[in-house]
Interface confidence: low
C-alpha cells in the first residue's frame, strides 16, 4: 500500500479580513493512526492552529467530522481573519506513539493572504491660513490596508493634482501598511468655496475609491479691498462718507474710523453680503457733522480682518466751503452702520 | 501605455457563433474587471455585463444571459465574448472597457476602450 | 433599472460657445455618474468620473456637477473637436445604464 501522502491543494488562499479562511487539507490512507495538527509558519517557532487530539482553538472549526473513523479530511475554518493571520500553514499528520505522538507528514502548506480595507482617508491642512498666490501643504493619510498595493491620487475641485509625495509604511513585509502624501496646492482668491480632496484606490475596495476631503476655506484667508468715499450731503452740516469693505474671507473684521488720527468709532462686521465666489462684502458709514471742524478733515477707514495687521484707507473732507456752527462739540453721529448691500 | 486592442470585424450567418477578443497591455490584466458593451446601428450604448478578471467569475445584465459567454486567459492578458445562436439583432459594435476600480469593484466607470468589433449577423 | 435622460437629443452650437448638457436618473445615484464623448466610427472616450472627476488629458473646459439625480456635463468654450455625441452613464446600481446621447453639432 502506497505511503501516506498528506495533500494541501492550495498553494495560496486569499480572504478579506473579518471573513473566514478554508484551509483544505486531506490525507491519502488511514495509516498510520495518529492525529492531525496545524500550524502557521515552520520550524521550531511554528505557532500552533489547531489540534485534533486535544486544546480549545475557538476560532477554528473542522469541515469534516474528524470523529469519523473513515475521515480523511482534515480541512479546517478559521473565523473572523484579521491581517495578523497572513502566513504560511501547513497540516501535519502525527503518527500514534508513546508517550508522544511523533511528526509523520506535512503539506506542502497554504499561504492565507489577508485583504484588510483602508481607513478613510483623512485630509488635514495647515494650522494657519494663507493668502492667495502661497503655497500650501496639505497630507492624507489612510491606514491598515493590506496588500500594500495601494493607489492614492490628489484632486483640487475636479482637476488632478500633480505636486504631491506619497509614502507606503513600511517598507518591508507587514501585516498591514499606511499610507501618508503630502500635496501642494496655489491658492488663489476664488478658493473660498474650492475643496482638495485625497482619492485611495484599493483592491479591497468593492465601490469607488475612498475620498477625503479638506475645505479650503478652513485655510485660506483673502484680504480685503478698501474705498473710502464721500456721499452727496444729507443735512447742511452733515457729510455721509462710506467704506466699502470688498471681497474678504473669513467674515472676522473690525472696522475703526479715525477723524484726524482720533479715533471715533469701532464696529465689528455683521450683517455682510456674501459674494459668488463665497468672500464677503461690508460697507461702514460716518455721519461726519462738519460745523464742529474748523479746518478739512482727514477720515480714515482702518480694518482689521482676521487678526492681521490693519490696513486703512484715508479720505480728506473739505469743510472751507460749509458755514461754522459755534459751539457744537459733535463730530460724528454712531448712528446706522453696517446698511446692507449687495454688489 | 494602457491599451485594449480588440479582434477585427466579423460576418456571421444567423444560428453561428462568433468570439470577439480583447487584449490588453500596459497594466496586469486581473487588476481591473472588464466590461463588455453594446452598440447597435445608430443607437446608445447598452452594457452587457463584465468579468471578474481576478476570479474569472462573470456578471450579465439581464439581456445577455445564455447565449453570451465572457471568459478570460490570464496568460495572454485577454478577455473574450463568445456569442452563440447568433441573431440578426445581435448585429452590433461590441467593446471592452475597463474600469477605474480594481478587479474586485463591480462595474463602474469606464476609464480605457477598446477600438471596438463589428459583428454582422446576416444571410 | 435606472433610466436615464439627457437634453437635448441634439444641441446645435457654434466654436467658442459655452455649452451645457443635462442628464437626470430616474433615481438616486449618489456622485456614481461618467461621461464618455463618441465620435462617429470610433470608441467611446472617458471624459469625466464621479460626477466631477476629469481624467487625465481631458482638457479643463470640460467640467461636469451634480449629484443625486441631476447632472450637467459643460463645456466653457467649444473647440472644432469637440462635435460628437456625449453619453453619461450611472455605476450606482445594477444594470449599469447609459442615456441615449447628446448630439453636439455645428450650428
Known amino acids: 500500500e502506497e505511503e501516506l501522502q498528506v495533500i494541501q491543494p492550495d498553494k495560496s488562499v486569499l480572504v478579506a479580513a473579518g471573513e473566514t479562511a478554508t484551509l483544505r487539507c486531506t490525507a491519502t490512507s488511514l495509516i498510520p493512526v495518529g492525529p492531525i495538527q496545524w500550524f502557521r509558519g515552520a520550524g521550531p517557532g511554528r505557532e500552533l492552529i489547531y489540534n485534533q487530539k486535544e486544546g480549545h482553538f475557538p476560532r477554528v472549526t473542522t469541515v469534516s467530522d474528524l470523529t469519523k473513523r473513515n475521515n480523511m479530511d482534515f480541512s479546517i475554518r478559521i473565523g473572523n481573519i484579521t491581517p495578523a493571520d497572513a502566513g504560511t500553514y501547513y497540516c501535519v499528520k502525527f503518527r500514534k506513539g508513546s508517550p508522544d505522538d511523533v511528526e509523520f507528514k506535512s503539506g506542502a502548506g497554504t499561504e492565507l493572504s489577508v485583504r484588510a480595507k483602508p481607513s478613510a482617508p483623512v485630509v488635514s491642512g495647515p494650522a494657519a491660513r494663507a493668502t492667495p498666490q502661497h503655497t500650501v501643504s496639505f497630507t492624507c493619510e489612510s491606514h491598515g490596508f493590506s496588500p500594500r498595493d495601494i493607489t492614492l491620487k490628489w484632486f483640487k475641485n475636479g482637476n488632478e493634482l500633480s505636486d504631491f509625495q506619497t509614502n507606503v509604511d513600511p517598507v518591508g513585509e507587514s501585516v498591514s501598511y499606511s499610507i501618508h502624501s503630502t500635496a501642494k496646492v496655489v491658492l488663489t482668491r476664488e478658493d473660498v468655496h474650492s475643496q482638495v480632496i485625497c482619492e485611495v484606490a484599493h483592491v479591497t475596495l468593492q465601490g469607488d475609491p475612498l475620498r477625503g476631503t479638506a475645505n479650503l476655506s478652513e485655510t485660506i484667508r483673502v484680504p480685503p479691498t478698501l474705498e473710502v468715499t464721500q456721499q452727496p450731503v444729507r443735512a447742511e452740516n452733515q457729510v455721509n462718507v462710506t467704506c466699502q469693505v470688498r471681497k474678504f474671507y473669513p467674515q472676522r473684521l473690525q472696522l475703526t474710523w479715525l477723524e484726524n488720527g482720533n479715533v471715533s468709532r469701532t464696529e465689528t462686521a455683521s450683517t455682510v453680503t456674501e459674494n459668488k465666489d463665497g468672500t464677503y462684502n461690508w460697507m461702514s458709514w460716518l455721519l461726519v457733522n462738519v460745523s464742529a471742524h474748523r479746518d478739512d478733515v482727514k477720515l480714515t477707514c482702518q480694518v482689521e480682518h482676521d487678526g492681521q495687521p490693519a490696513v486703512s484707507k484715508s479720505h480728506d473732507l473739505k469743510v472751507s466751503a460749509h458755514p461754522k456752527e459755534q459751539g457744537s462739540n459733535t463730530a460724528a453721529e454712531n448712528t446706522g452702520s453696517n446698511e446692507r448691500n449687495i454688489y | 501605455q494602457i491599451q485594449l486592442v480588440q479582434s477585427g470585424s466579423e460576418l456571421k450567418k444567423p444560428g453561428a457563433s462568433v468570439k470577439v477578443s480583447c487584449k490588453a497591455s500596459?497594466?496586469?490584466?486581473?487588476?481591473?474587471?472588464m466590461n463588455w458593451v453594446r452598440q447597435a446601428p445608430g443607437q446608445g450604448l447598452e452594457w452587457m455585463g463584465f468579468?471578474?478578471?481576478?476570479?474569472?467569475?462573470?456578471t450579465y445584465a439581464q439581456g445577455f444571459k445564455g447565449r453570451f459567454v465572457f471568459s478570460l486567459d490570464t496568460s495572454v492578458s485577454t478577455a473574450y465574448l463568445q456569442i452563440s445562436s447568433l441573431k440578426a439583432e445581435d448585429t452590433a459594435v461590441y467593446y471592452c472597457a475597463r474600469t477605474r476600480g480594481y478587479y474586485d469593484f463591480d462595474g463602474g466607470a469606464f476609464d480605457y476602450w477598446g477600438q471596438g468589433t463589428l459583428v454582422t449577423v446576416s444571410s | 433599472d435606472i433610466q436615464m435622460t439627457q437634453s437635448p437629443s441634439r444641441l446645435g452650437a457654434s466654436v467658442g460657445d459655452r455649452v451645457t448638457i443635462t442628464c437626470r436618473a430616474s433615481?438616486?445615484?449618489?456622485?456614481?455618474l461618467a461621461w464618455y464623448q463618441q465620435k462617429p466610427g470610433k470608441a467611446p472616450k472617458s471624459l469625466i468620473y464621479?460626477?466631477?472627476y476629469r481624467y487625465i488629458g481631458v482638457p479643463s473646459r470640460f467640467s461636469g456637477s451634480g449629484s443625486g439625480t441631476d447632472f450637467t456635463l459643460t463645456i466653457s468654450s467649444l473647440q472644432p473637436e469637440d462635435f460628437a455625441t456625449y453619453f453619461c452613464?450611472?455605476?450606482?446600481?445594477?444594470?449599469?445604464t447609459f442615456d441615449q446621447g447628446t448630439k453636439l453639432e455645428i450650428k
Open positions: 500596459g497594466y496586469s490584466i486581473t487588476n481591473y474587471a
Open positions: 433615481q438616486n445615484v449618489g456622485t456614481h
Open positions: 452613464q450611472q455605476y450606482n446600481t445594477y444594470p449599469l
Open positions: 468579468i471578474n478578471t481576478y476570479t474569472g467569475e462573470p
Open positions: 464621479s460626477a466631477i
